[in-house]
């Protein structure tokens, strides 16, 4: 019989608003009061097993006690009504859970999208957390027809996909209702034609066709998405070279109406391009499609757009009446080769007479020439045709080169080695820059580059190493032959020397010592030696440092103490720091030469 509860709490399943007040009433049953000899005064209220202070109780009558909570801040409160029975034993009467939360906020920013081939999906912001189960329902209607409600799933409460087919060109009104145990609110209504919310499928079957007639164009063709039968489209076409990471875009005004092909112009010959395309409603109302799959195409070859860089070297050990000349040239970069270079054609004309032709697959040609003046020409050939000719005058043996560049400077900047000069007054056809690494261990093997006659500043185009000394030579080339070369040394990046100088004594006197050292080998300098510092000390004394100009190879220490052991070492400094050499010791004599004790 006592399995039946001794009483009950009202309300039974309360849902209350956070930070509000709440009152619960426990009503005891007569049979229970009789059995335990209790009344409402014996009621003890507990929350989550903690006793609530009596001040919060109100005895309503002999059977009922109430408890009031102010500013509820817990989301779940287990509230129990208990009675004190014989010998102060606590007996549970009834228990409830007080659930607290917030009413829903008005949903905001309602928007809809129709992905082609799918049904309309709308999404919204639901506002603050309610801590309660809150149902969101998307409502939609025509002026003449109500559509089935779309109930948002519990795991995606801020969006819903309708169950009916989208109808374009008929305005629809859409809104969201949010409801929980504490209230119901409605979003603002939005009214629109779904055709203005379309996200088309991307164009497909994108393909690229090149043109034999024009090496600067590629024609794109594609299949439009099915929605083309309903709306007019505009496009965004992007392209890049195969190895680039950034995309270029066709001007929007060129692709602003429905089409299924487009010719991209002003492309580089013999270059692989990657294309992609997306589309949207022509008037810009709606959403861009995703990008199509990418498609590649290669522009047709064009004749090389530039003559190769062209230079020569004369073997100094030439036989009587002849000299060995090595003609050399650079391969054209792809953007100038405009195709696969098949071969090079070299012609050599002795002054006003004999012509020799050579077809070469390499980038050099060694020829034996007389001591006369020659004119050499070079063209590069691909499938389409030949480049313009590079022309080089190889002067006669007795030619005296003059007119060098002036004010030659070289300096590192932005991880490149820059060279600049003042142009000679005479008309320069081109400049040849040669550079090599100076080393005590290996000969100076030169690389080279050509610059236009109008240039007076450039950077060396090669794989340059840090902390290596480069000897850079600039030769102006005139119509009648090369001018005088000018050279300069430079570093891409300096470092402290790898080794310090080894100091030794040249002569030691009673109060002075002449120190000497060798210049550091270029391989260990790692930069320009700006100065030396000599450090010397006695065993008991402080160290003294003396700065010495880098042009010196000896130095005299004066005011030394006689009959004393000195320790000396030397450091060499570049712009990036210094390095000490080994320590050396010497002892000053007790007496000067010829001095008697």
């Amino acid at each position: 019989e006592l399995l039946d509860p001794c009483g009950y709490i009202s309300p039974e399943s309360p849902v209350v608003q956070l930070h509000s007040n709440f009152t619960a009433v426990c009503v005891l049953k007569e049979k229970c009061m009789d059995y335990f000899h209790v009344n409402a005064n014996y009621i003890v209220w507990k929350t989550n097993h903690f006793t609530i202070p009596k001040e919060q109780y109100t005895i309503i009558n002999r059977t009922a006690s109430s408890v009031t909570f102010t500013d509820i801040s817990s989301l779940n409160i287990q509230l129990t009504c208990n009675i004190l029975t014989f010998g102060q034993l606590e007996q549970n009467v009834y228990g409830i859970t007080i659930i607290s939360g917030l009413p829903p906020e008005k949903p905001k920013n309602l928007s809809c999208i129709v992905n082609e081939g799918k049904k309309m999906r709308c999404e919204w912001n639901r506002g603050r957390e309610t801590h309660l189960e809150t149902n969101f329902t998307l409502k939609s209607e025509w002026a003449t027809h109500k559509f089935a409600d779309c109930k948002a799933k519990r795991d995606t409460p801020t969006s819903c996909t309708v169950d009916y087919s989208t109808v374009y060109f008929v305005n629809i009104e859409v809104w969201v209702e949010a409801e929980n145990a504490l209230g119901k609110v409605t979003s603002d209504h939005i009214n629109f034609d779904p055709v203005y919310k379309v996200k088309p499928n991307p164009p497909h079957n994108l393909s690229v066709i090149n043109s034999e007639e024009l090496s600067s164009i590629l024609k794109l063709t594609w299949t439009n998405p099915s929605i083309k039968s309903v709306i007019r489209l505009k496009y965004n076409i992007q392209y890049r070279t195969k190895d680039a990471s950034t995309w270029s875009q066709i001007p929007p005004e060129d692709t602003a109406s429905t089409r299924s092909s487009f010719t991209v112009q002003d492309l580089k010959p013999f270059t692989e391009y990657v294309f992609r395309i997306c589309c949207m409603k022509e008037d810009g109302k709606g959403y861009w499609s995703d990008w199509s799959e990418e498609a590649n195409g290669i522009t047709y070859e064009d004749r090389p757009s530039k003559a190769p860089s062209f230079w020569y070297k004369i073997d100094p050990s030439h036989a009587q009446g002849y000299r060995t000349v090595q003609l050399m040239w650079k391969t054209l970069p792809p953007f100038e080769a405009n195709g696969k270079i098949l071969d090079y054609e070299v012609t050599l004309t002795r002054w006003k007479s004999h012509l020799q032709n050579y077809t070469v697959n390499d980038t050099k040609l060694t020829v034996n020439l007389t001591n006369d003046r020659y004119v050499a020409t070079l063209t590069a050939r691909n499938l389409v045709g030949k480049s313009d000719a590079a022309v080089l005058t190889i002067p006669a043996c007795d030619f005296q080169a003059t007119h060098p560049v002036m004010d030659l400077k070289a300096f590192p900047k932005d991880n490149m080695l820059w060279v600049e000069w003042t142009t000679p007054r005479e008309s320069v056809k081109k400049y040849i820059l040669e550079w090599c690494v100076l080393s005590d261990k290996a000969p100076c093997i030169a690389d080279w580059q050509q610059e236009d006659g109008t240039v007076h500043r450039t950077h060396l185009r090669g794989n340059l190493a840090e902390s290596k000394c480069y000897l850079i030579t600039v030769t102006p080339v005139y119509a009648d032959g090369p001018g005088s070369p000018e050279s300069i040394k430079a570093y891409l990046k300096q470092a402290p020397p790898s080794k310090g100088p080894t100091v030794r004594t040249k002569k030691v006197g009673k109060n002075e010592a002449v120190l000497e050292w060798d210049q550091l080998p270029v391989d260990v300098q790692n930069g320009f030696i700006r100065n030396y510092t000599i450090f010397y000390r006695t065993i008991i004394g402080n160290e003294t440092a003396v700065n010495v100009d880098s042009s010196h190879t000896e130095y005299t220490l004066s005011s030394l103490t006689s009959d004393t052991l000195y320790m000396v070492r030397m450091a060499a400094y570049t712009d990036e720091g210094g390095k000490d050499g080994p320590e050396f010791t010497f002892t000053t004599p007790k007496f000067a030469q010829g001095e008697i004790e």
């Epitope: 081939g117 374009y168 008929v170 998405p225 099915s226 039968s229």
Partner: antibody, heavy 128, light 108 residues
Framework: QVQLQESGPGLVKPSETLSLTCTVS????????WTWIRQPPGKGLEWIGH???????NYNPSLKSRVTISVDTSKNQFSLKLTSVTAADTAVYYC??????????????????????WGQGTTVTVSS | DIQMTQSPSSLSASVGDRVTITCRAS??????LNWYQQKPGKAPKLLIY???SLQSGVPSRFSGSGSGTDFTLTISSLQPEDFATYYC??????????FGQGTRLEIK
């Protein structure tokens, strides 16, 4: 109450051009497709084509090379031109209104509504 | 083109009868089929659109059903004014719109 009235010659010579006009009264020409349908004597209905108020046209592929439909919104009229007619073009020609509304089902598209207002029809005979 | 085939081509019935006309599409047209009624010497009149939606002003004894390829027009209790020819029409938006060949409903 919207009404449609076809007008044009009842007799056209073979190889000439058939021209008909449909006048819309009692309502706007906007927000609808305006359709031409024909019915040869004792036969079924054949859709010729239609035009929207913005001028977008759709034609029956079997007639496309010979048909032009145009609209004049200022006069609330739309017209049909059918070139190079033969005796097979003899029919009752109807104009009709099709409310805008295209339903999307996957990537297929359907006119949602039916042709809800029709003219009474005009008989055109092709004969020399 | 989508072909529409109506059956029967003609049928005889009496006032008060329940009559069913069927229409079959050569490929799926979802639920986008319309039914028209045409009386001799008159223009067709729209009865049902989108397979089952009753056009405004049309008596409720007319009803439509079906989807995909098979559709029916039902007249629940035939009235004297219902004797006419009935056409189905598919409304696929890519041309052409096509009609069935018609079903002639006569008084028995």
């Amino acid at each position: 109450q919207v009404q449609l009235q076809e007008s044009g010659p009842g007799l056209v010579k073979p190889s000439e051009t058939l021209s008909l006009t449909c006048t819309v009264s009692g309502g706007s020409i906007s927000n609808y497709y305006w359709t031409w349908i024909r019915q040869p004597p004792g036969k079924g209905l054949e859709w010729i084509g239609h035009i929207s108020n913005s001028g977008t046209t759709n034609y029956n592929p079997s007639l496309k090379s010979r048909v032009t439909i145009s609209v004049d919104t200022s006069k609330n009229q739309f017209s049909l031109k059918l070139t190079s007619v033969t005796a097979a073009d003899t029919a009752v020609y109807y104009c009709a209104r099709l409310p805008l509304g295209i339903a999307a089902v996957d990537t297929d598209y359907y006119y949602y509504f039916g042709m809800d207002v029709w003219g009474q029809g005009t008989t055109v005979t092709v004969s020399s | 083109d989508i072909q529409m085939t109506q059956s029967p081509s003609s049928l005889s019935a009496s006032v008060g009868d329940r009559v069913t006309i069927t229409c079959r599409a050569s490929q799926s047209i979802s639920s986008y089929l319309n039914w028209y009624q045409q009386k001799p010497g008159k223009a067709p009149k729209l009865l049902i659109y989108a397979a089952s939606s009753l056009q405004s002003g049309v008596p409720s004894r007319f009803s439509g059903s079906g989807s995909g390829t098979d559709f029916t027009l039902t007249i629940s209790s035939l009235q004297p004014e219902d004797f006419a020819t009935y056409y189905c029409q598919q409304s696929y938006s890519t041309p052409p719109i096509t009609f069935g060949q018609g079903t002639r409903l006569e008084i028995k």
